[in-house]
């Protein structure tokens, strides 16, 4: 049966915690991704940014989980208007920023 949205968000948060906790070397070899606007459509925007990182097993589960939250198909090279123009950050920082934002969404009951 489908997982309740609150449970799915909690699981995504815990996965991001695991990523930030378990990194010994730079996450995804220090790969850079587009920074995103966290105020709306965060799941699809985050997926659009992270999907351009390939060969990084540490974030594969996160990519799959974000895919479950995003209602449309996302493919590499696709950029929404939610991207912060010409600003790239390391995946590790991207994940930290995303984690804090998702914890706030959980607090506010915004599970979808």
């Amino acid at each position: 049966s489908p997982v309740p949205p609150s449970t799915a968000l909690k699981e995504l948060i815990e996965e991001l915690v695991n990523i930030t906790q378990n990194q010994k070397a730079p996450l995804c070899n220090g790969s850079m991704v587009w920074s995103i606007n966290l105020t709306a459509g965060v799941y699809c925007a985050a997926l659009e940014s992270l999907i351009n990182v390939s060969g990084c097993s540490a974030i594969e589960k996160t990519q799959r989980m974000l895919n479950g939250f995003c209602p449309h198909k996302v493919s590499a090279g696709q950029f929404s208007s939610l991207r912060v123009r010409d600003t790239k950050i390391e995946v590790a920082q991207f994940v930290k920023d995303l984690l804090v934002h998702l914890k706030k969404l959980f607090r506010e009951g915004q599970f979808n």
Epitope: E14, V17, T20, V100, K103, K104, R107, E108, G109
Partner: antibody
């Protein structure tokens, strides 16, 4: 300015009751979750109870559940804590605290009263 | 219920950096808040939502939260920073607010 003022503290015998009140001013009281936090002499902070901004939900620490009741009157900007069956371990400074209200009351406490002392002793 | 563990005391010389930790099972999944309390006074919020700082709090105060440990860092410590510091989270599972035991910061 924004203010929380507690009252009702004092010395009470074990097993008796006491009612604390908190008068809020300078902000939209009805839009905030309100908490009680206590601090025993020389000890750390202990959360006691919360009431949602509209009074629709209340939650309590296990140590006071079934004995304490938190209520609010949004028309009078007041918060109350009815304390029954008091024990010696309830002796503490009791703080009235404000927290912005979300779906869950995970917000930080951004305004504290100065506290009122409750002493439970025979 | 959820338990937060803080060291009872931390000592630091003026001008140095103080690090106060708050341990909890997967605390990185929670939003952590920090309070400063000076003797005879009510606590004051110094960091909220892991990393954010209220307007009146100096930039010397910063927070982080990852894995099983949240951290309050005070850089260029001053004598006036001497106080008790408490971490706090909301436990979603039990609908209760939880405080750490507190850390007494002593400025040598």
């Amino acid at each position: 300015q924004m203010q929380l003022v507690e009252s009702g503290g004092g010395v009470v015998q074990p097993g008796r009751s006491l009612r604390l009140s908190c008068a809020a001013s300078g902000f939209a009281f009805r839009t905030y979750g309100m908490h009680w936090v206590r601090q025993a002499p020389g000890k750390g902070l202990e959360w006691v109870a919360v009431i949602w901004y509209d009074g629709s939900a209340t939650h309590y620490a296990d140590s006071v559940k079934g004995r304490f009741t938190i209520t609010r009157d949004n028309s009078k900007n007041t918060l109350n804590l009815q304390m029954n069956s008091l024990r010696a371990e309830d002796t503490a400074v009791y703080y009235c605290v404000r927290a912005p209200q979300w779906y869950l009351s995970a917000e930080a406490f951004d305004l504290w009263g100065q506290g009122t002392m409750v002493t439970v002793s025979s | 219920s959820y338990v937060l563990t803080q060291p009872p005391s931390v000592s630091v010389a003026p001008g140095e950096t103080a690090t106060i930790t708050c341990g909890g099972n997967l605390i990185g999944a929670y939003l952590v808040h920090w309070y400063q309390q000076k003797p005879g006074q009510a606590p004051v919020l110094v960091i909220y939502d892991d990393v954010d700082r209220p307007a009146r709090i100096p930039e010397r105060f910063s927070g982080s939260n990852s894995g099983n440990t949240a951290t309050l860092t005070i850089s260029r410590v001053e004598a006036g920073d001497e106080a008790d510091y408490y971490c706090q989270v909301w436990d979603h599972d039990t609908n209760t607010m939880v405080f750490g035991g507190g850390t007494k910061l002593t400025v040598l």
